[in-house]
């Protein structure tokens, strides 16, 4: 030891950074410095160890201005290996606070190459991927060769970069990966003997996923009750946490705290810290914070605790005392604003009886009654009964619920006919709408005129978006109205309004609408008012059954509001199948006020024209083709024959007489009369009867005497008969001129 210049750092008696000694020897280490100093020793050397002695710093050196201290360790052992440091004591004036000198002492022992031996149980070493990992198999001699192995059979070889060996620290893995997770061991062979120390690396992550406190904030308690708060920290697998609490009574350790880990979850760890305070007092109220730390990660969660001296209930309407809802709603919540502690028992009454017993649709949720699938039956008075038995506190409050119903027109729900009905021209008609709703709906009748063009076929003439007019009994719109009336009636136990519109004289087509509305909504029923001058809206007529050579005349009349695409077809059956044959040369259909007419004329028919003729029209509403059939049988032609020949006849002058010429034939014969071979025309005093079959002569004169002949003719031939008419009371003349 020289006593030269001032020592910035203490000076040790052993020079260099390290020193090797044998186990069993004594370690002498002196420290000299400019100020008082202290020693720091390896963790494996206990200050209480009898073998250790340290002299307190005392004056030494020239002029006794320096301080010296000696450390003596008798019979040094392998586990005394480590860093020995002498450092200046920090003083308020000293600038040498961090001034120190260290030396690493190896206490070499062939029987203990490793300072720490972990053979029975591996030492757990936490690792974080990407960070430095140290396998701390420190040795007692810098000359020991150590191999790092990973179970079951891998050797991790130092490469001077990622994996390095330091006899003072162990194996240093610069940036650890999952490959280093598992059972690792350090092996050293000394004097032919194998030594092993084992380490179990364990992945450490610091990911805190979630922190929660149960029960949720705010927590309310009565004086004397027990407060239990469970703080739950959810982390990634392999994350370890430190959990702590801040709370009003922390300074006096009011709470007991228990911790546990739940590893039953497959993808994370759940840590629980349970804080418990028995017999809470007013001083325990306030903010409770659960603090969760994992490495550099930190999360906290707060909850507020209220402590009440005694229980209380206050209840108010959350909305108005009278509430309204609508039938058909998925749910309605009747809610009261309640402040109470402890939680009261809750019973809801409907019209004085327990609501939940009345219907399974009533659900109690907190201070609310939830009504599922609201119906009119749910209208009534609802009372919430609140009671805290232990505090003998009871309160109740009633709210009235009105269930409104959107108007409904019952005739709309009854399945309507696929096509609208037809109203006979000139008829009196009663139109009815049966309406239900809450509040009671107002009913109005409207008229939508149909702006149709008579000159052409239109089947889209009447649309519901035409302008509409509100009707009253005196309205002169559309058809004359006899009356509009309303009456109340009970149907299926509910009050319904029946509104009736009486049409006095059905003349004008259009749409009548009954509209029912209340504050919930509006509903409308449209009644297509189609007037018809055709029975049933479809009529087929045959003028007469034709004979061979005559004309066939068929007529088809359809209601123009209901039918379109009118045509005549001939039905023929071939091999039990009915074929539809279109008929060419049909006339154009003619459109009238209410109907469409299509006439079919087939001239000069033959027997082959016999058959089933059908008029086909398409229903505008159903799209269905409707047929009306008529059988036509063309009669075979037959030459005329007289049923009775004429016979001579006498008649008095100024009298009258009838000559009858009844003929048959197909077609019906034409009858012509001759007198004295001159064709007789109808003139005053001579009348030809129906079909010329009778000849009537009034006020007979002598000029009327003569030969009368009738002739019956058709395509097949002719037949005639003659007779002489004698007029009595005339001068004698020759019968024949």
């Amino acid at each position: 030891y020289g006593s030269g210049s001032k020592l910035k750092v203490p000076e040790l008696s052993l020079k260099g950074t390290q020193h090797v000694m044998q186990a069993g020897q004594t370690l002498f280490l002196k420290c000299r410095g400019e100020a008082a100093h202290s020693w720091s020793l390896p963790t494996t050397v206990s200050q209480e160890d009898k073998r250790l002695s340290i002299t307190p710093p005392s004056a030494c050196g020239r002029d006794n201005r320096q301080f010296c201290s000696t450390l003596t360790l008798d019979t040094a052992q392998a586990n005394h290996t480590g860093l020995y440091t002498c450092r200046y004591l920090p003083t308020s004036t000293s600038k040498k606070k961090k001034a120190e000198s260290s030396i690493y002492i190896f206490v070499s022992d062939a029987g203990s190459p490793f300072i720490e031996m972990h053979t029975d149980i591996p030492k757990l070493v936490h690792m974080t991927e990407g960070r430095q990992l140290i396998i701390p198999c420190r040795v007692t001699s810098p000359n020991v060769t150590v191999t790092l192995k990973k179970f079951p059979f891998d050797t991790l070889t130092p490469d001077g970069q990622r994996i390095t060996w330091d006899s003072r620290r162990g194996f240093i893995i610069a940036n650890a990966t999952y490959k280093e997770i598992g059972l690792l061991n350090c092996e050293a062979t000394v004097n032919g003997h194998l030594y092993q120390t084992n380490y179990l690396t364990h992945r450490q992550t610091n990911t805190i996923l979630d922190v929660q406190i149960r029960p949720p904030s705010p927590v309310r308690l009565l004086h004397g009750q027990t407060l239990v708060l469970n703080c739950t920290a959810t982390t990634e697998l392999n994350t370890r946490v430190q959990m702590s609490w801040n709370y009003p009574g922390k300074a006096t350790k009011r709470a007991s705290i228990r911790q546990r880990i739940d590893r039953s979850h497959s993808h994370n760890n759940v840590f629980h810290s349970v804080l418990k305070i028995n017999n809470v007092e007013s001083r325990d109220k306030g903010l409770y914070t659960c603090r969760v730390k994992s490495g550099s990660s930190f999360q906290s969660f707060n909850t507020s605790v209220h402590v009440y001296e005694k229980g209380f209930i206050s209840v108010k309407h959350r909305k108005q005392p009278v509430q309204e809802t609508t039938a058909g709603r998925r749910s309605y919540r009747l809610s009261m604003k309640v402040k109470a502690f402890p939680s009261p028992e809750i019973v809801w009454l409907k019209d004085g009886s327990p609501a939940t017993l009345k219907s399974a649709r009533y659900l109690v949720h907190g201070y609310s009654l939830i009504i599922k699938d609201v119906t009119t039956e749910d209208a009534g008075d609802y009372t919430i009964l609140l009671g805290i038995k232990q505090s003998r506190l009871f309160k109740n409050l009633t709210a009235t619920l009105i269930v409104n119903v959107k108007p409904q027109i019952y005739e709309k729900s009854v399945s309507s006919l696929p096509s609208p009905p037809l109203y006979p021209l000139g008829s009196r008609q009663v139109l009815t709408c049966t309406v239900y709703g809450i509040p009671r709906p107002t009913i109005t009748w409207l008229w939508h005129p149909c702006h149709h063009n008579h000159s052409k076929e239109r089947y889209d003439f009447c649309t519901e978006n035409e302008e509409s007019f509100i009707l009253d009994p005196s309205s002169n719109l559309g058809n004359r109205i006899e009356s509009i009336s309303q009456r109340m009636t009970v149907i299926e136990g509910t009050n319904k309004t029946v509104s009736t519109l009486v049409v006095a004289d059905s003349q004008t087509p259009g749409i009548y609408s009954c509209r029912a509305f209340n504050k919930i909504g509006t509903v409308e029923r449209n009644i297509k008012f189609y007037v018809t001058d055709v029975p049933n809206g479809f009529h087929v007529s045959l003028e007469k059954m034709p004979a061979e050579g005559e004309d066939l005349k068929l007529s088809c009349v359809v209601n123009k509001f209901l039918y379109r695409d009118i045509t005549w077809i001939l039905l023929r059956t071939v091999n039990n199948r009915t074929m539809h044959h279109s008929i060419s040369k049909q006339k154009m259909a003619t459109t009238q006020d209410y109907s469409i007419t299509l006439n079919l004329v087939i001239k000069n028919v033959s027997l082959e024209d016999s058959g089933t003729y059908a008029c086909r029209a398409r229903n505008i509403y159903t799209g269905e083709d409707i047929l009306r059939k008529t059988e036509v049988l063309v009669r075979d032609s037959e030459a005329p024959h007289l049923l009775q020949n004429l016979s001579d006849y006498e008649v008095s002058i100024s009298g009258s007489t009838t000559l009858d010429c009844q003929a048959r034939g197909v077609p019906a014969p034409q009858i012509t009369w001759f007198k004295n071979n001159h064709k007789i025309q109808q003139e005053p005093g001579i009348i030809l009867g129906p079909g010329n079959s009778t000849l009537f002569i009034e006020r007979v004169t002598e000029e009327d005497e003569g030969v009368y002949r009738c002739r019956a003719t058709n395509q097949k031939g002719a037949v005639e008969s003659a007779a002489y008419l004698t007029v009595q009371g005339t001068s004698d003349k020759s019968n024949l001129e």
């Epitope: 149980i121 591996p122 079951p152 999952y178 490959k179 598992g182 992945r203 697998l237 392999n238």
Partner: antibody, heavy 116, light 111 residues
């Protein structure tokens, strides 16, 4: 909770092949070595094969060496055992096992029957 | 034939203490950790003891393990009927790089 679910077992003729799979959940699969262990009907446990966590090293029992191949796909949390040239004596329940402290966690096993 | 030797059977009455031995060699039990497994009828084996004597969480402290030289043993005190099962010891053998199991011991709880 650690779960190991084996699949791929079945009936196969001698000389045939099978591929067993093991799907892992509830732990960080790539951190752990994995074993296949089998148990013949009415017999004791027999270790079959091990694979290190990174898949770089494997070992096999003498009875299956050269016929069986162990592999893993850490991205799919899956362990496999490819079994070729199967023999009647390979009939057993095959267990997938996680290795850390010991053989910590076992699957429920999949049955392999080798019979003509 | 198993590398590790276990008695094929053992028995005891409820409340009794039963010990199952496991004998090996220097390359397995002698130089590596021993683990013990319990297999209840019809179920997969379960880790009972690791690192010679450590118990996983959830395993009752009635089960204990020990190791000396090339032998290990499992002791079950306060025997219960639910302990009736097959018990296997295992260790890594670093001479041949394989896991070795004992042949298993069937434990019967009498009465």
């Amino acid at each position: 909770e650690v779960q190991l679910l084996e699949s791929g077992g079945g009936l196969v003729q001698p000389g045939g092949s099978l591929r067993l799979s093991c799907e892992a959940s509830g732990f960080i699969f790539r951190d752990y070595n994995m074993n296949w262990v089998r148990q013949a009907p009415g017999k004791g446990l027999e270790w079959v094969s091990i694979i290190t966590n990174d898949g770089s090293s494997t070992a096999y029992s003498d009875s299956v060496k050269g016929r069986f191949t162990i592999s893993r796909d850490n991205s799919k949390n899956s362990l496999y055992l490819q079994m070729n040239s199967l023999r009647a004596e390979d009939t057993a329940i095959y267990y997938c096992v996680k290795v850390y402290y010991g053989m910590d966690d076992w699957g429920q096993g999949t049955t392999v029957t080798v019979s003509s | 034939q198993s590398v590790l030797t276990q008695p094929p059977s053992a028995s005891g009455t409820p409340g009794q203490r039963v010990t199952i031995s496991c004998s090996g060699g220097s390359s397995n039990i002698g130089s590596n950790y021993v683990s013990w497994y319990q297999q209840l009828p019809g179920t997969a084996p379960k880790l009972l003891i690791y690192f010679n004597f450590q118990r996983p969480s959830g395993v009752p402290d009635r089960f204990s393990g020990s190791k000396s030289g090339t032998s290990a043993s499992l002791a079950i005190s306060g025997l219960q009927s639910e302990d009736e099962a097959d018990y296997y010891c295992a260790a890594w053998d670093d001479r041949v790089n394989v896991w070795v199991f004992g042949g298993g011991t069937k434990l019967t709880v009498l009465g």
